[in-house]
Structures are given as C-alpha cells and as structure tokens.
Amino acid sequence: GITIPRNPGCPNSEDKNFPRTVMVNLNIHNRNTNTNPKRSSDYYNRSTSPWNLHRNEDPERYPSVIWEAKCRHLGCINADGNVDYHMNSVPIQQEILVLRREPPHCPNSFRLEKILVSVGCTCVTPIVHHVA
Amino acid sequence: GITIPRNPGCPNSEDKNFPRTVMVNLNIHNRNTNTNPKRSSDYYNRSTSPWNLHRNEDPERYPSVIWEAKCRHLGCINADGNVDYHMNSVPIQQEILVLRREPPHCPNSFRLEKILVSVGCTCVTPIVHHVA
C-alpha cells in the first residue's frame, strides 16, 4: 500500500475502537447532482434490455432512497422491436457503501454497510451448456 | 418524512457542527462480497454493448479502489456479431457515496462525497434529430 504522512492538523480520536470509528462530515461534496435516475437519462426505456426503476426507501439508511433496476424482459428487444429469447436481459450490479444507523434510530451514529444494487440492464449472449 | 423516536442509548455529540459530523464505524457489514467486477460476472465480455473495466485508485478516498466501465464500441454488436452503428453503446452511470479524507492524509476524519461512476454499458436506440 501507499504510506502517506499523517497531517499534524488531524482531529484526535480517544475512542477505544479507533481506527474503526471515525468522524464523518455529512455535508456532502458534489451534493447538487441528480439522484433520480429517471431524470438523468432515458436509457432505461431506449435500451434493448429495458428496465424499470423501483424506489427503495429505508429511514435507517443513508442515503435513505436508493433506486433499483429490474429488467423488463428475460430476452432482449431485437431489430424488429420484438422480444428475442436467444439473448438475455441481465441486471448490471454494483456494490455500494451506505451508512446504517447503529444503534437504530440514532441521528449521529452509523456503521458502514456494503449493499449490492442493480443499476440497469444489459443484453448478453446466453451461456450454452453442451451436453456430452 | 418519517419521524422515528430517538434511541435513548445513542452516543452524545458535543460537536458544534452536529448533526453534520457523525461517528461512523468502518467495520463494514457484508464485507465479504466480491469487489472485483471481473470475477463476479463476465457480462462485460458477453454483452452486445461490451465494456472494459479500468481500476481507479485514490488513497485519499474510501474505498480507495473503484472500477470504471468504458464502452468498447460506439455501436453495438448485432445479431451476426458485427459492430453496428445503427445502435449505440452507452455507459450506465450511478452516483455513489465515498468517504474523502478531510483534512487530507488524516486516518480518522472524512467527508462524504458523491461521485458518478460508470458501472457497465447498455445498447440503446439512438435519438434521431430530424432537420426541418
């Protein structure tokens, strides 16, 4: 790994769990970007593997609202506009970090959590298993 | 919004910036999932809008490694297996939260940051602008 000299102006931490418990400023840098994926692009409707977006809300999580993609079809839309089952619509998933209130219902204490979210769908060639 | 009663066992915060500065436990819940997208699925190679994955590393960020997708072609792969410019490969982007060391090089002090990452690519019908 890369060793970086510690900044002498860093806050102190007396916490016995240090460095597992850290201070985080929730005043988000780059806050003004768009969080509703429907507004930011219409790819979900124009894709050959179109998807619907579902709102997942959890007040114990930060961010409390996450949008989940669900592929509309098992197959993909072909050049004629029909669903073609020779191909598969599959979700593209990504692991993201969220903050989970811990203990529950606490406004100023969180734990990092990794969750897997479906961001959109793509059209793939199916894996064909040949029987001997 | 939903009002949730505060848990009486919550840690106190004397910080003048409260509730902007919070305590976060970095001992990640669900840590054992796979962070290298190449290992978790081969969709990037099997998609009709295939993509390459590029490793983006920043020691001042948590997580320090993020994988970025770059579409391989402007067009998509058609039913014959050829690059076809009647369709477009486009990146599916998602906003994610990361922790940025603030002040820089501090091991226990962070600020939340929103960044836009490309997770994969999908094949879309192009928007055709008709000239009057």
Epitope: H86 | D42, G75, A79, D80, G81
Partner: nanobody, 114 residues
Framework: QVQLVESGGGLVQPGGSMRLSCAAS????????GAWYRQAAGKQRELVAR???????NYADSVKGRFTISKDNAKNTVSLEMNSLKPEDTAVYYC????????WGQGTQVTVSS
C-alpha cells in the same frame, strides 16, 4: 489495447494442409463474429470465410469445400482449416473479429509453392 494474434502461417506444398489460428487478448469472442480475409500481392483484400455469433458460416466461392472456419469461445480463438491448398491461395491472411468496424490482426503469410 485489444490484440488479435495470428499463428500457423508459412510455406506449404500444393495439395497440402495448414491451420491458421487467431487468439484474442483482453476481450471475449462469444459476442463477436469471426472472419478471415486475405490479400495477395498487388490485389485487394478479400473475404475468405466468416462465422456469425451464432455459428452460421459463409465462404468465398474459391475456397468452398476446402476451407473450414470455426470459433472456440472457451479458448477465445478463431481458426481456419485449409486443405487442398493451391498456389493461388498464396497471400497474407488477416483475422477479423466484429466485422469491418471491429478488430483486425496483423496478418500472417501463407505461401503455397513447390
């Protein structure tokens, strides 16, 4: 950077056989078509054989019944089996993946001569 590496070229006697192979690095071939083109000295590049993503094959009239194209997605290769070779098959053979706007190999020389 995507590389298509051709192998198997060289000198062969008329009536002989040769197998050309093309291996792709960094990309999977399952989504792509595969093809072999050739260019003889002083002539234009011509399509010899192609195989679609789903395994449908097409051949130039001059090689039908003598050449066989195949694609192995597991091994990430496109191959050309050439039998009953003739002097007029002498050319630089190029591997192609993904059609005209896809990826091209550097070429391998095939010389049919006694």
């Amino acid at each position: 950077q995507v590389q298509l590496v051709e192998s198997g070229g060289g000198l062969v006697q008329p009536g002989g056989s040769m197998r050309l192979s093309c291996a792709a690095s960094t990309i999977g071939l399952s989504i792509y078509s595969g093809a072999w083109y050739r260019q003889a000295a002083g002539k234009q590049r011509e399509l010899v054989a192609r195989i679609t993503r789903r395994g449908v094959t097409n051949y130039a009239d001059s090689v039908k019944g003598r050449f066989t194209i195949s694609k192995d997605n597991a091994k990430n290769t496109v191959s050309l089996e050439m039998n009953s070779l003739k002097p007029e098959d002498t050319a630089v053979y190029y591997c192609n993946v993904g059609g005209e706007d896809g990826y091209w190999g550097q070429g391998t020389q095939v010389t049919v001569s006694s």
